[in-house]
């Protein structure tokens, strides 16, 4: 799996995933989060090559039609496959409140 | 939605369903398909610019980065959302064969 | 420049429902609380509540709670707010107004022309 | 809940006189070194609009004549060399407790 396990762990150039810490004031203006100040929300990033984590019938078909085709420009994108969720907290008023939001952290991708 | 009917009949620089039409013998090597030569696979293609057709609460996080991040090369991608079946025909020995391949055809992309 | 134009005026029976409609421009709208907030004709200003349209967390005046649902569509920036069981009471004018955004309750810096809402049978 | 007085309910200046109106809440909004406590204008058939943020913070745009100053519980808006067109209802605001609270308004 294109893992944080394995994609952090080595110099992989196809899709895979990777690290990317986002500052939730200074990188997204918001400024009224209190915890954390930042994440570790990570990116997809890689090119997908023929048989490279394929996530459906058609990016397979996709990325047979590039090799044939090598210079088209229909090919399968590194994305995200599984997201994690972060909790936040944040004050209304004086009184503390305790969000999760879902999707937030990418922990492994696919080429779709 | 980013789809065969708004896509097609616009001019739209950002994500969105584009045509392509594989033959199966010239663009895969699929030479044993018996009907249908080829097919429209579609695909997507296109900037995702911040609010344009995001899929989670990541990829809206991603967008809004990339806004504060112009440069950096984190940021969602355009890829397909719903895929349809395609019916083919092949042989085995003598004896055609109707198979149902799915996910083969995009009607719509997304930002992820 | 930061723009919030709201949907006209409406008129309701009794216990009907009226949803209002904030459309923002010239401004990144998952930035950024909105806010709704309601005058009486003749009265002060009285806060309903208010969202992030990030990814829809909202914050709401015990006084509406259960009558009122504010959502967001990120797609076209757009905020809404939808107001239940209508009655006399009800009948005023109806603002979006945008959090300054250091905190999630704020100051509003930017305000919509607000929309007119009369209940009568 | 905090509730906003405003006095007087209603002035009336001359051109280039002083105006000042107060406020006092119900209990202290102030927190973490900041006064949550914010001044509006809305003219005649206009909506609000912001002057003064966090107690004595000029909002950008606003004329230097809107001063707003205070801590704790009373707080004073002044405007200097009062024009026509500061014609209207100025409302108080807190944030410092939920929910959000207006004063009543001095026209």
């Known amino acids: 799996a294109l893992d944080t396990n394995y994609c952090f762990s080595s110099t992989e150039k196809n899709c895979c995933v990777r690290q990317l810490y986002i500052d939730f004031r200074k990188d997204l203006g918001w400024k009224w989060i209190h915890e954390p100040k930042g994440y570790h929300a990570n990116f997809c990033l890689g090119p997908c090559p023929y048989i490279w984590s394929l996530d459906t019938q058609y990016s397979k078909v996709l990325a047979l039609y590039n090799q044939h085709n090598p210079g088209a420009s229909a090919a399968p994108c590194c994305v995200p496959q599984a997201l994690e969720p972060l909790p936040i907290v944040y004050y209304v008023g004086r009184k503390p409140k305790v969000e999760q939001l879902s999707n937030m952290i990418v922990r492994s991708c696919k080429c779709s | 939605a980013l789809d065969t009917n708004y896509c097609f009949s616009s001019t739209e620089k950002n994500c969105c369903v584009r045509q392509l039409y594989i033959d199966f013998r010239k663009d895969l090597g699929w030479k044993w398909i018996h009907e249908p030569k080829g097919y429209h696979a579609n695909f997507c293609l296109g900037p995702c610019p911040y609010i344009w057709s995001l899929d989670t609460q990541y990829s809206k996080v991603l967008a809004l980065y990339n806004q504060h991040n112009p440069g950096a090369s984190a940021a969602p991608c355009c890829v397909p959302q719903a895929l349809e079946p395609l019916p083919i025909v092949y042989y085995v020995g003598r004896k055609p064969k109707v198979e149902q391949l799915s996910n083969m055809i995009v009607r719509s992309c997304k930002c992820s | 420049e930061v723009q919030l134009v709201q949907s006209g005026a409406e008129v309701k029976k009794p216990g009907a429902s009226v949803k209002v409609s904030c459309k923002t421009s010239?401004?990144?709208?998952?930035?950024?609380?909105m806010n709704w907030v309601r005058q009486a004709p003749g009265a002060g200003l009285d806060w309903m509540g208010q969202?992030?349209?990030?990814?829809?967390?909202?914050n709401y005046n015990e006084m509406f709670e259960g009558r009122v649902t504010l959502t967001a569509d990120t797609s076209t920036s757009t905020a809404y707010m939808e107001l239940s069981s209508l009655r006399a009471g009800d009948i005023a004018v109806y603002y979006c107004?945008?959090?300054?955004?250091?905190?999630?309750?704020?100051?509003?810096?930017?305000w919509g022309q607000g929309t007119l809402v009369t209940v009568s049978s | 809940d905090i509730v906003m007085t405003q006095t007087p309910p209603s002035l009336s200046v001359s051109p280039r006189e002083t105006a000042s109106i107060s406020c006092r809440a119900s209990?202290?909004?102030?927190?973490?070194?900041?006064?949550?406590m914010h001044w509006y204008l809305q003219k005649p058939g206009q909506s609000p609009q912001l002057l003064i943020y966090l107690a004595s913070n000029l909002e950008s745009g606003v004329s230097d004549r809107f001063s707003g100053s205070g801590s704790g519980t009373d707080f004073t808006l002044r405007i200097s060399r009062v024009e026509a067109n500061d014609t209207g209802v100025y409302y108080c605001?807190?944030?410092?407790?939920?929910?959000?609270?207006f004063g009543q308004g001095t026209k």
């Open positions: 969202i992030f349209p990030a990814w829809g967390s909202t």
């Open positions: 605001q807190q944030n410092d407790e939920d929910p959000l609270s």
């Open positions: 107004a945008r959090g300054y955004g250091n905190y999630a309750l704020d100051a509003m810096d930017y």
């Open positions: 209990e202290s909004v102030d927190s973490y070194g900041n006064s949550f």
């Open positions: 010239g401004y990144t709208f998952m930035t950024y609380w």
